[in-house]
């Protein structure tokens, strides 16, 4: 399951990318998951109310929420592995506050790698890929055994 | 130069289980990546997984997990392919290859694994 | 898997002819697209990788181009020593996959 150093430097490499423009990224990465798993949506009260791709790209708010996103995740990248810290409260206020489930949180990896295939195919081939397939894996796995420690079925 | 030496051919029974190894000189062995190939008599090239050896990270083809598993002794800087239940099907010549962003830059010369009773 | 056709699957030619191998990936690949030769005797070797850049040591004639899908190997000036299977593989998603493989006569 553990990343070798040249994975997370694929990952890092990659992730360089994305904070290039990290608001462009989180607004891609919500739309297609909102698109793709409609049933997502329902735990965002402030994007409930949006319907088409149209309206998803004019809302200010979900590009806010995406940049929101993707700056957590990149803070756990970063710490390559070494993430207690920063997952504890993620999971707290996940598991206790948002309940979002960790099927949710494949559905969102699934749609950061579709959004980087897209945006960066040549940066991300199938080493990268692997690579951060495997990162996102170690985060799911570590916000799962958090939300079993809080008692959230998630 | 970069080299990587394959052990050699075998002939081994069906059921049984085989370790091939690949001793790669002429460069740090942890700084690249390590993958086996399989090529049946006059066929095409399958490959069967990689394997970081300063990480012991592994990606494996679906179609060969539980059959390879792959390893890799740093202090040597040697790497493994174990087979095993070995049936007819697993005849064939199998080879390592250094790995460089997806590309495999230098290949070992292969070994021949022969599986018959 | 992506799926990875070669053709032709092989290919007589005479020395000091141009020849020109294709690859067409199942999907976009983009450029992750390497080519390799394999000689009798299990000697294989990369020649091109990310579908245009020449891999050390390998002689100016063998060059590749495309992205996407479609590729190409040209070999120019065909000599003696070039007589051996030309595989493709792409680098774009695992599995890693290879093309069926061309073989190279001279005529």
């Known amino acids: 399951m553990g990343l070798s150093d040249g994975e997370w430097q694929l990952v890092l490499n990659v992730w360089g990318k994305v904070e290039a423009d990290i608001p462009g990224h989180g607004q891609e990465v919500l739309i297609r998951l909102f698109k793709g798993h409609p049933e997502t949506l329902e735990k965002f009260d402030k994007f409930k109310h949006l319907k088409s791709e149209d309206e998803m790209k004019a809302s200010e708010d979900l590009k806010k929420h995406g940049a929101t996103v993707l700056t957590a995740l990149g803070g756990i990248l970063k710490k390559k592995g070494h993430h207690e810290a920063e997952i504890k409260p993620l999971a707290q206020s996940h598991a206790t506050k948002h309940k979002i489930p960790v099927k949710y949180l494949e559905f969102i990896s699934e749609c950061i790698i579709q959004v980087l295939q897209s945006k960066h195919p040549g940066d991300f081939g199938a080493d990268a890929q692997g690579a951060m397939n495997k990162a996102l894996e170690l985060f799911r796995k570590d916000m799962a055994s958090n939300y079993k420690e809080l008692g959230f079925q998630g | 130069q970069v080299q990587l030496q394959q052990s050699g051919d075998d002939l081994v029974k069906p059921g049984a289980s085989v370790k091939l190894s690949c001793k790669a000189s002429?460069?740090?062995?942890?700084?690249?990546?390590i993958n086996w190939i399989k090529q049946r008599p006059g066929q095409g090239l399958e490959w069967i997984g990689r394997i970081a050896p300063e990480g012991d990270s592994t990606y494996y083809n679906e179609m060969f997990k539980g059959k390879a598993t792959l390893t890799v002794d740093t202090s040597s800087s040697t790497a493994y392919i174990q087979l095993s239940s070995l049936s007819s099907e697993d005849s064939a010549v199998y080879f390592c290859a250094r790995e460089v962003r997806n590309a495999m830059d230098y290949w070992g010369q292969g070994t021949s694994v022969t599986v018959s009773s | 898997d992506i799926q990875m056709n070669q053709s032709p699957s092989s290919l007589s030619a005479s020395l000091g002819d141009t020849i020109t191998i294709t690859c067409h990936a199942s999907q976009n690949i983009h450029v992750w697209l390497s080519w390799y030769l394999q000689k009798p005797g299990n000697i294989t070797k990369l020649l091109i990788y990310e579908a245009s850049n020449l891999h050390t040591g390998v002689p100016s004639r063998f060059s590749g181009s495309g992205s996407g899908t479609g590729f190409t190997l040209t070999i120019s000036s065909l000599q003696p020593e070039d007589i051996a299977t030309y595989y493709c593989q792409q680098g774009q998603r695992y599995p890693l996959t290879f093309g069926g493989g061309t073989k190279l006569e001279i005529k």
């Open positions: 002429g460069y740090t062995f942890t700084s690249y990546w």
